[in-house]
């Protein structure tokens, strides 16, 4: 259940995170699952445990197997399993499927390729990038932090992209490579200044005290895949996360929809058990992309009690 596949190449660094790790600072013990033998924490060992991380510096084919991690607390131990496979380096350029990370797709307007697993390593820029084993050269390719951006993506940019970087551990350097496929969606898209579909600017919504209500912030940003397009709610000019009122929550994740070919994004603000003080707040729907920011404000008002009374005597 709490198991994660990890893989690497012999003579490269491999760092694996415990699948059960939630918060930092908890004690994590690592074991070889087959023998129940504890993995040492001393860094002089080629394979050693470092808190939530298990480090193979460098990895060997014989390291393949299942490793157990236990996140320890006096009242709640939590166990996870790392299924590690180390492969021999391929003599030719071909990268087999079992060494591939998840495929990403892009378009003319969105061509980010993230280097998989890089956040686990102590690396310094720049990353080296290869396509089908050829080093990428030219002004179209920009290695930015942990990802590659390709300008003016074309269909023949599809292929297998490998990132290569150096992991540094106590002054010693180890090479790491990771490969993923990139596919190109052929679509003529465009981006424009955000248009907010809902709410209308300076709208007022009637609500009942004690009831739940939802506010939808919906905006369109152009056609096709968008490089940056986000919508969010603010309360009195503050982020929802900075507003310590658990009754008011912005739904996690944003729903993307394509309306008449337009790329539209919406997010819902859920207000549970509406209170009098909620009527005093200013609710701002913000839509942001590379062209700029648009804001629509909505306020809540108390539903007129007469609405609930029968017109018949």
């Amino acid at each position: 259940k709490f198991s994660k596949q990890s893989w690497g190449l012999e003579n490269e660094a491999l760092i694996v995170r415990c699948p059960r790790q939630g918060k930092s600072s908890y004690i994590v013990d690592w074991y070889y699952s087959q023998t129940n033998k504890s993995i040492p924490t001393q860094e002089r060992n080629r394979v050693f445990a470092s808190g939530q991380l298990l480090k193979f510096l460098p990895a060997e084919v014989a390291d393949s197997g299942i490793y157990t991690c236990i996140v320890r607390s006096p009242t709640f131990n939590r166990t996870g399993y790392a299924n590690v496979t180390i492969y021999k380096k391929q003599p030719d350029c071909n990268v087999p499927d079992y060494l591939m990370y998840s495929t990403v797709s892009g378009s003319e307007k969105n061509s980010k390729i993230y280097c998989p697993t890089i956040d686990l390593y102590n690396w310094t820029a720049p990353l080296e990038w290869f396509k089908n084993c050829q080093a990428l050269q030219g002004s179209r390719y920009k290695a930015h932090k942990s990802f590659l951006v390709i300008d003016n993506v074309m269909t023949d940019d599809a292929g297998d992209y490998t990132c290569k970087f150096i992991h540094n551990e106590n002054g010693a350097n180890y090479s790491v490579t990771a490969t993923r496929s990139f596919t190109v969606k052929d679509e003529q898209g465009f981006s424009r200044f955000p248009v907010i579909r809902a709410p209308a600017h300076n709208e007022t919504k009637e609500v009942e005290i004690g009831e739940n209500t939802n506010l939808t912030c919906s905006a369109c940003f152009g056609k096709g895949a968008q490089f940056l397009a986000t919508v969010q709610w603010q309360l009195n000019g503050n982020k929802i996360t900075d507003f310590s009122e658990p009754r008011i929550q912005q739904e996690e994740g944003q729903n993307q929809s394509f309306s008449n070919g337009l790329a539209c994004v919406n997010t819902v603000l859920r207000i549970a058990d509406v209170k009098e003080e909620d009527l005093l707040l200013r609710y701002d729907c913000l839509a942001l992309n590379l062209h700029g920011l648009r804001r629509h404000t909505i306020r809540l008002s108390r539903k007129n009690p007469i609405d609930h009374q029968s017109t018949y005597c």
Epitope: K23, S25, Y26, S73, T75, F76
Partner: antibody
Framework: DVQLQQSGPGLVKPSQSLSLTCTVT?????????WDWIRQFPGNKLEWMGY???????YYNPSLKSRISITRDTSKNQFFLQLNSVTTEDTATYYC??????????WGQGTSVTVSS | DIVLTQSPASLTVSLGQRATISCRAS??????????MHWYQQKPGQPPKLLIY???NLESGVPARFSGSGSGTDFTLNIHPVEEEDAATYYC?????????FGAGTKLELK
């Protein structure tokens, strides 16, 4: 994000059972974590009552062990508190919460329960 | 059961000043290099909110003006500089053994 919504009666008669429901959205209660009940007495004192882990194991506060039962309905992603033989001393605000390791990371909105005839 | 004693029961601090809250456990809550003491903030009409876990680790999203320290039986929550929104009741909680218990709370008011 994990969200917890509580429901249940606000008034219970002495010697009867108190039953509360906590409905979880945004996370499956069988995936991980422990799912707690905590109460806060009128003087603001907090008491951990017990929890049910993702595996179904339960842990109770010994001070309540003979009267408390925490169960779940995995199909509805709900967990429940039942406290038997209540007295006026059980008047409190009852919270459900999520324990990831040792701390209650997400809380329900709280349900005020009065025990009175 | 491990009893947690908080002091003071209430304190009044000026904006921008330091607030210090103590929590003493009836027996050690530290073991194997970690201290299983945590701090929460509660505002009226709201559930408690986790601030600090394992004595000194700041929970994600909590402002850096909150800090925790201590080991064994003596723990401290510091808030500096105190801001208006910090007016609340603060609780310590241990997880060294069952049952988990809380302190009685410290009410922080602003001058």
């Amino acid at each position: 994000d994990v969200q917890l919504q509580q429901s249940g009666p606000g008034l219970v008669k002495p010697s009867q059972s108190l039953s509360l429901t906590c409905t979880v959205t945004g996370y499956s209660i069988t995936s991980d974590y422990a799912w707690d009940w905590i109460r806060q007495f009128p003087g603001n004192k907090l008491e951990w009552m017990g929890y049910i882990r993702y595996s179904g194991d339960t842990y109770y506060n010994p001070s309540l062990k003979s009267r408390i039962s925490i169960t779940r309905d995995t199909s509805k992603n709900q967990f429940f508190l039942q406290l038997n033989s209540v007295t006026t001393e059980d008047t409190a605000t009852y919270y459900c919460a999520t324990t990831m390791m040792d701390t209650m990371d997400y809380w329900g909105q709280g349900t005020s329960v009065t025990v009175s005839s | 059961d491990i009893v947690l004693t908080q002091s003071p029961a209430s304190l009044t601090v000026s904006l921008g000043q330091r607030a210090t809250i103590s929590c003493r456990a009836s027996k050690s809550v530290s073991t194997s290099g970690n201290s299983y003491m945590h701090w929460y903030q509660q505002k009226p009409g709201q559930p408690p909110k986790l601030l600090i876990y394992l004595a000194s680790n700041l929970e994600s999203g909590v402002p850096a003006r909150f800090s925790g320290s201590g080991s064994g039986t003596d723990f401290t929550l510091n808030i500096h500089p105190v801001e208006e929104e910090d007016a609340a009741t603060y609780y310590c909680q241990h997880s060294r053994e069952f049952p988990l218990t809380f302190g009685a709370g410290t009410k922080l008011e602003l001058k």
